[in-house]
Each structure stands twice: as C-alpha cells, then as structure tokens.
C-alpha cells in the first residue's frame, strides 16, 4: 500500500481467482483512543472499533472511504484505491489504445516548436467518476523541473455505438533551451482514478522527436499575367521556433482534383513560394516538417484554385 | 552519374553543402544500422543517449544563433574554448564567436572521426562481418573537415590490443551514430544560419 | 541508368523565342522532378527552372521568371522549357537534370543525373 496523496491510498493486488488479497490496517488520525468506531463509504454498519482497524483487501467491494469517528463526530477519513496487477501486468482498463505510432500507446504527446512547451492526449470511453493527475520531469534520476497543468475533457467523439472523450494537458519544462541537443528523454506519468480503480500510464520522448508544426500560414494565390499559372506563397507558422534561418523547414506542395481519378502531383521545397498550373475545382495545399529532423509533418493548409 | 555537379552557388556559405552532405550520410548510415542490426538495441528508444563530446567541445553554445543568447536557459554552459580562423570564414563574417563556432564543430568532426575509425578497424574483424561504417559517411566527415580548415593536432587512431567484444561494438556504434546524427542536425541548423546571416 | 539528352538550342536574335527538349531514356522520368540548370562561359552553372512528377508545380529562376515556362509530357518522357523574350544574358549551355527523387531543388548538387548540354546564343 502507498500514498497517493493526503488520505488517499493505492493497494497493489495481484487480480486473479481466490487471490489472498493484501492485508491493510488503517490507523486513525486522531489523539483520541477509545470509543473509536470504523465504517465504510455511506454505509453505518460499525466494522470494527478502536484506533486501527485491520482489513484484509482482495476485491472493489473492499476498496472505498473509511471513516473512523467518535460519539457521532467524524475523526479521519481513508481512500482505499485498488490497483489490478494481472499476470504480472498492470491493468489498462481506464485509457484506450490509441494503437499509434504503436500497440500499448495510451499517451500520445505533440510539441509545436522547440520551446519546451508540449502537449499530452488520451482517450476513454467513461464519461464519470474519472479524474487525473499529470506529473512530468526531464529524465528520470536526477528530474529536471516540467510544470504540467490540470488535465482537461478537449473533444468527444461519437464511435459507433459508443462516446469517446479525449482529455488533454499541457506542459512545459521550466528551463528550457530551443537549440539544446536533448540527452535525456522527458517522462511524462498520468494516475487515473475510475471510481476505485486506480492505473498510472507513462511516456518518455524527446520533444525532438514529437515535433509537430502547424500548418504554413497566409497560404496566397497570385495569379499570373497572360498564363493559367498562379503563384502559390505561404509563410512559417507563427508557433514555429526562431530564427528561421536556424529552425527551418522544408514544405510539401501538393495539387489535388476535385475527382480522386485525377492525378495528384506533390513535390518538396525549402522555399516558401511555387508556380502552379491551376485547374478548375483543384486544391492547392501545403504542409511543413522540419528540414533536418524528420518528425511529424504538419496538418494540410489548403486552398481551392477557382 | 554523367556530369559532375558544379560547385554550390557563388556567395554561398561554402560548408552548407557539405553539411548537408554529412547529415545525409549518418542518417542513411543510421537507418542500415537499425535495419542491420535488428536484433540488437539500436532505437532512440533502446540506446543510452551519449555525447563523446561532452565537456571537450562546446557547439551548441558556441554556435548559439544572436536571437537564443538572451535566452537563459541556453546560456547556463556557455565556455570559450577555441578561437583560430577557417576557409569557411568568409572575412566581413569572422567574428571571434563565429570561429570559435566552426573550429567547435572542427573538433567535433574530429573526434567522432577518430572514433568511426576505431570502430571501423573491429568490425572489419568481426567474422560475422555484419556491418561497417559506410566509406561516404567517412569520406564526407573529411569533407567538411578540410572545408573548415582548422590547423588542429591529429589524434591518433585509438588501437586496442584485446580481442574486440563484437557485441558491444555493435551496440556502441548505434549509441555513436544516434549521437553524431543530433549533432548533424546542429551543425546544419548552424550552417543554415550563417549562410542567411 | 538515366540518360538525358537536351536538343533545340542554336542562334536566336534579342526579343525571340526558343524552345529547348530534354529526352530522358533508360528510366520512366514520371514520377520525378525535372530541372533546367545554365551555364555562361566563366560562370557558376545557375538554376533556370524546375517542374513536379505530374507538371503542375514548378519554380523558376527570379531572371527567368514570367519570360520562361518549364513543361513535361510523361507519355514521351520529354521535359521542355519555352524561353521567350530572349536577352543577351540568357546566352548559355542549358543543362537537363533530373535526380531521381521529387524536390524542387535549385541548385545543382541536389541532382545527380545530367545531360551533355545544348548552346543557345542570344546575339544581333
């Protein structure tokens, strides 16, 4: 059993038929000794008295608050959380694979530019009684300071027959350099809390490698004198990290018809303008990577011909 | 390959293409490596991440582009090191930070040279005769080396007179290779600014 | 093996009109990007203009710009590149090149493969 915050404990069980269960004794936080009394949750059927009580842990059923009091008047309370361990693995029943960039990815996590500045997502399908809490450092031995804020609901999805709800978190490592060549990977750890249920999730990056531009913006035809040709200029993002001439990036220029039977052409270029034949009903959209670290390319900024 | 390709742009930084050059080289020599040696712990995610160069050079504050010295964080190990002049030096350019910033790289170059090398002469040794360090990869340090021109101290090949351990040679040019690709990128971020500064 | 083989150029008075070809053999030049590169006598070979795999994107040279247009046919494997309102300084080798990959890259160590060049000379 350990502390998960002020009053709130976590027991580790090993989750498997007739499992002996873990053996808890919760001790009230009081000077008082005598005529204590233990009950759990809402319930007042007395489970016992004095100024421990010892329980023998092996199901939900068992988890839940534990109050002692004395002649009506609440003393403490106790969160009992239960944290499944089946087949020597840790449950993941709260958060939901998201399978990408491979199996058992439960935090994805996404950073703009070099700043230190990075945000984290997940996914579940329980819609109540479900609360997180985000912790992050830069490496794991010596932990270098990241302030992450409180996670929030950002989207729900309809999947099917079922809701999906995304929650997401922002942080930030509190000193950061954008030209640093990391080292150490930064660590991010969520506790998810269901009801009693209690599971911790983790991911360990390099902000290099979660690098994600926003798409080009001011995304311009021009079209040109006495030819269907138009000139096509964007800009960098404003979130991207300066000076450009330092993080630069390289673009994907790319035509696409209206019909899927049309043909697709998309070329690649360091500048920030092109020359485009324009049809009628095609699109012209641009996206943005880094030009000497192949991460994420960034989402399609697009605009249509006519 | 017909023709030979001409000489970069007049006016052009002359070590960008080089630079450009070697961040190709050690990507694609990292790429056969992980491919290679599969069954070995070569990704970002399996190696420890370590810098030879660590408390001998100082590139990435020496290199510092104008607009990040203001920023702290990026001035907590700022050292002065080296200070000698380079062909890469075009002369309204030389400035004491900016050779003091090539000759870091210099000596980066240098000491990972050194160490390729070193690496090279075991695996040639290796009966399972696995894998070897691409001669461009090589060749293209040279380059950039001889682009840079610093009068500088050859040092000598390491040479070792146990039998190698072919594992951890192996294991230690996927820590090498990961390490010389992030100070590829370095090296061409720093070209790419000096060349539009 | 790419072979690249550039034809059309000669003699042409100030205000005229040329048009180069570039015939590609031994490779399907399709999915591809094209360039036109120039070299004057004593001169660093410069970009002209460089066209995408299907040939609606291009990017040209700032001196060529609006008087040059870069043009592909895949079925004939043929890069073309109209040169109009001709000048003095446009007298050059005009070099095809190709690198087998999709960049639109101007300068010229970014390709690899290159044909044998055809004069155009601008004079009165």
């Known amino acids: 059993i350990w502390e998960l915050k002020k009053d709130v404990y976590v027991v580790e069980l090993d989750w498997y038929p007739d499992a002996p269960g873990e053996m808890v004794v919760l001790t009230c936080d009081t000077p008082e000794e005598d005529g204590i009394t233990w009950t759990l949750d809402q319930s007042s059927e007395v489970l016992g008295s004095g100024k421990t009580l010892t329980i023998q842990v092996k199901e939900f059923g068992d988890a839940g608050q534990y109050t002692c009091h004395k002649g009506g008047e609440v003393l403490s309370h106790s969160l009992l959380l239960l944290h499944k361990k089946e087949d020597g693995i840790w449950s993941t029943d709260i958060l939901k694979d998201q399978k990408e960039p491979k199996n058992k990815t439960f935090l994805r996590c996404e950073a703009k530019n070099y700043s230190g500045r990075f945000t984290c997502w997940w996914l579940t399908t329980i819609s109540t009684d479900l609360t997180f809490s985000v912790k992050s450092s830069r490496g794991s031995s010596d932990p270098q300071g990241v302030t992450c804020g409180a996670a929030t609901l950002s989207a729900e999805r309809v999947r099917g027959d079922n809701k999906e709800y995304e929650y997401s978190v922002e942080c930030q490592e509190d000193s950061a350099c954008p030209a640093a060549e990391e080292s150490l990977p930064i660590e991010v750890m969520v506790d998810a809390v269901h009801k009693l249920k209690y599971e911790n999730y983790t991911s360990s990056f390099f902000i290099r490698d979660i690098i994600k531009p926003d798409p080009p913006k001011n995304l311009q035809l021009k079209p040109l004198k006495n030819s269907r040709q138009v000139e096509v200029s964007w800009e960098y993002p404003d979130t991207w990290s300066t000076p450009h001439s330092y993080f630069s990036l390289t673009f994907c220029v790319q035509v696409q018809g209206k019909s899927k039977r049309e043909k697709k052409d998309r070329v690649f270029t360091d500048k920030t303008s092109a020359t485009v034949i324009c049809r009628k009903n095609a699109s012209i959209s641009v996206r943005a990577q880094d030009r000497y670290y192949s991460s994420s390319w960034s989402e399609w900024a697009s605009v249509p011909c006519s | 390959r017909n023709l030979p390709v001409a000489t970069p742009d007049p006016g052009m930084f002359p070590c960008l293409h080089h630079s450009q050059n070697l961040l190709r080289a050690v990507s694609n020599m990292l790429q056969k490596a992980r491919q290679t040696l599969e069954f070995y712990p070569c990704t970002s995610e399996e190696i420890d991440h370590e810098d030879i160069t660590k408390d001998k050079t100082s590139t990435v504050e020496a290199c510092l582009p104008l607009e990040l010295t203001k920023n702290e964080s990026c001035l907590n190990s700022r050292e002065t090191s080296f200070i000698t002049n380079g062909s890469c030096l075009a002369s309204r350019k030389t400035s004491f930070m900016m050779a003091l910033c090539l000759s870091s790289i210099y000596e980066d170059l240098k000491m990972y040279q050194v160490e390729f090398k070193t690496m090279n002469a075991k695996l040639l040794m290796d009966p399972k005769r696995q894998i070897f360090l691409d001669q461009n990869m090589l060749a293209v340090i040279d380059e950039l080396m001889q682009a840079l021109n610093f009068n500088s101290e050859t040092v000598p090949q390491k040479s070792s007179l146990e039998e190698p351990d072919f594992y951890k040679t192996k294991i230690k040019l996927c820590i090498l290779l990961h390490a010389f690709r992030i100070r590829a990128v370095t090296i061409d971020r720093v070209m790419s600014y000096l060349n539009a500064s | 093996q790419v072979q690249l083989v550039e034809s059309g150029g000669g003699l042409v008075q100030p205000g005229g009109s040329l048009r180069l070809s570039c015939a590609a053999s031994g490779r399907t030049l399709s999915s591809y990007t094209m360039a036109w590169f120039r070299q004057a006598p004593g001169k660093e070979r410069e970009f002209v203009a460089t066209i995408s795999p299907v040939g609606f994107i291009m990017d040209y040279a700032d001196s060529v710009k609006g008087r040059f247009t870069i043009s592909r046919d895949n079925t004939k494997n043929t890069v073309y590149l109209q040169m109009n309102s001709l000048k003095h300084e446009d007298t050059a080798l005009y070099y095809c090149?190709?690198?087998?990959?999709?960049?639109?890259?101007?300068?010229?160590?970014?390709?690899?493969?290159w044909g044998q060049g055809t004069q155009v000379t601008v004079s009165s």
């Open positions: 090149a190709t690198d087998l990959g999709r960049k639109l890259g101007t300068q010229s160590r970014e390709y690899g493969y």
